[in-house]
Amino acid sequence: APVLPGEDSKDVAAPHSQPLTSSERIDKHIRYILDGISALRKETCNRSNMCESSKEALAENNLNLPKMAEKDGCFQSGFNEDTCLVKIITGLLEFEVYLEYLQNRFESSEEQARAVQMSTKVLIQFLQKKAKNLDAITTPEPTTNASLLTKLQAQNQWLQDMTTHLILRSFKEFLQSSLRALRQM
């Protein structure tokens, strides 16, 4: 079974410990990833002025980054646990290619970038165990991801900085929305 960051595998195996998918552990795990994103963003902001760019300017991009919408069933008003969980897992799977792109984008925070990527994989595994409707989860095509990765890496330096900033900000917002929804499950 996947082990959360900062957790001992023997704790996980203990007979009276909480199940791995308890909201407290998922909460802690998502916050661990959020902390990693913050560290990566500090490096990004220190080396470029992207963080000063207005949200509107950043919105003018052709990245198809996952986002929560009303129809996804993650807001309490139209809350649907199964639909929402599928959206969260699908979104995280879609972010994986972007997290792969980030791997060569950091110098001093290279390990942090890897930790964010690996922690996200572990989070996906946790949530897949929790999901009843695994058939509804669409995994991105490897060939599509490979061509997207090539395209992103071929951008000029300015666009790569912009892309890095956008991915980190969007991933943060997606994780925060996911955490709010998972708290209701």
Epitope: D27, R31, L34, D35, I37, S38, R41, C45, C51, K55, M68, E70, F75, Q76, S77, G78, R169, K172, E173, Q176, L179, R180, R183, Q184
Partner: antibody
Framework: EVQLQESGPGLVKPSQTLSLTCTVS??????????WSWIRQPPGKGLEWMGV???????YYSPSLKSRTSISWDTSKNQFSLQLSSVTPEDTAVYYC??????????????WGQGTQVTVSS | NFMLTQPPSVSGTLGKTVTISCAGT?????????VSWYQQLPGTAPKLLIH???TRASGIPDRFSGSKSGNTASLTISGLRSEDEANYYC??????????FGGGTQLTVLG
């Protein structure tokens, strides 16, 4: 003990830009998962949320004020600021800065500044 | 300009119970469990009473309680005291990374 203190001009002319600063003591503005909001209260009226800057420096604004509002921070001084452009007399209010202790799953304000009165008049 | 709907004023008798309502939509109160309540005395900054619908802030007596049903939140004050006379505001998180306040309710405590 966290303390917030607003500062800025008490009188601003119509069409000008209102600039206010909130100085935070007793804790860093970059502490995860804190967020820092500006909230105003026109005379005799209710509270109006204007916008927020979170622990990463990300900003979000009230849809009704978005086009005129800008929030920024100076982490070296532990301050965050509000700029409201093209002001009119309707922007006359007491302006408060406030802290949200957990922007991920909190959304409440546990510490407030004492407020600063801003009047828009020629 | 979005605003949650509160009654402009309510009154209650010393020692009795009063409830203040706060009506919103599925995009704010109905959509999230992030409702908070504040007390504001004249000439002072608001003070946090309740957050996350029903959690009392540090140092707030259990005479103050919060609840929510659908798109409406409520603040209940029992054992009314004269010092409870103040303005009360509700607030809620709103899609997406926004917050919204109510118009405020003036509570009058009758002898």
């Amino acid at each position: 003990e966290v303390q917030l203190q607003e500062s800025g001009p008490g009188l601003v002319k119509p069409s000008q830009t209102l600039s206010l600063t909130c100085t935070v003591s007793g804790g860093s503005i970059t502490t995860r998962y804190y967020a820092w909001s500006w909230i105003r209260q026109p005379p005799g009226k209710g509270l109006e949320w204007m916008g927020v800057i979170d622990y990463d420096g990300d900003t979000y604004y009230s849809p009704s004020l978005k086009s005129r509002t800008s929030i920024s921070w100076d982490t070296s001084k532990n301050q965050f600021s509000l700029q409201l452009s093209s002001v009119t007399p309707e922007d006359t209010a007491v302006y408060y800065c406030a802290r949200d202790p957990d922007v991920v799953t909190g959304f409440h304000y546990d510490y407030w500044g004492q407020g600063t009165q801003v009047t828009v008049s020629s | 300009n979005f605003m949650l709907t509160q009654p402009p004023s309510v009154s209650g008798t010393l020692g009795k119970t009063v409830t203040i309502s706060c009506a919103g939509t599925s995009s704010d109160i109905g959509g999230y469990n992030y409702v908070s309540w504040y007390q504001q005395l004249p000439g002072t900054a608001p003070k946090l009473l309740i957050h996350r619908v029903s959690t009392r802030a540090s140092g707030i007596p259990d005479r103050f309680s919060g609840s929510k049903s659908g798109n409406t939140a409520s603040l209940t004050i029992s054992g009314l005291r004269s010092e409870d006379e103040a303005n009360y505001y509700c607030a809620s998180y709103r899609n997406f990374n926004n917050a919204v306040f109510g118009g405020g309710t003036q509570l009058t405590v009758l002898g």
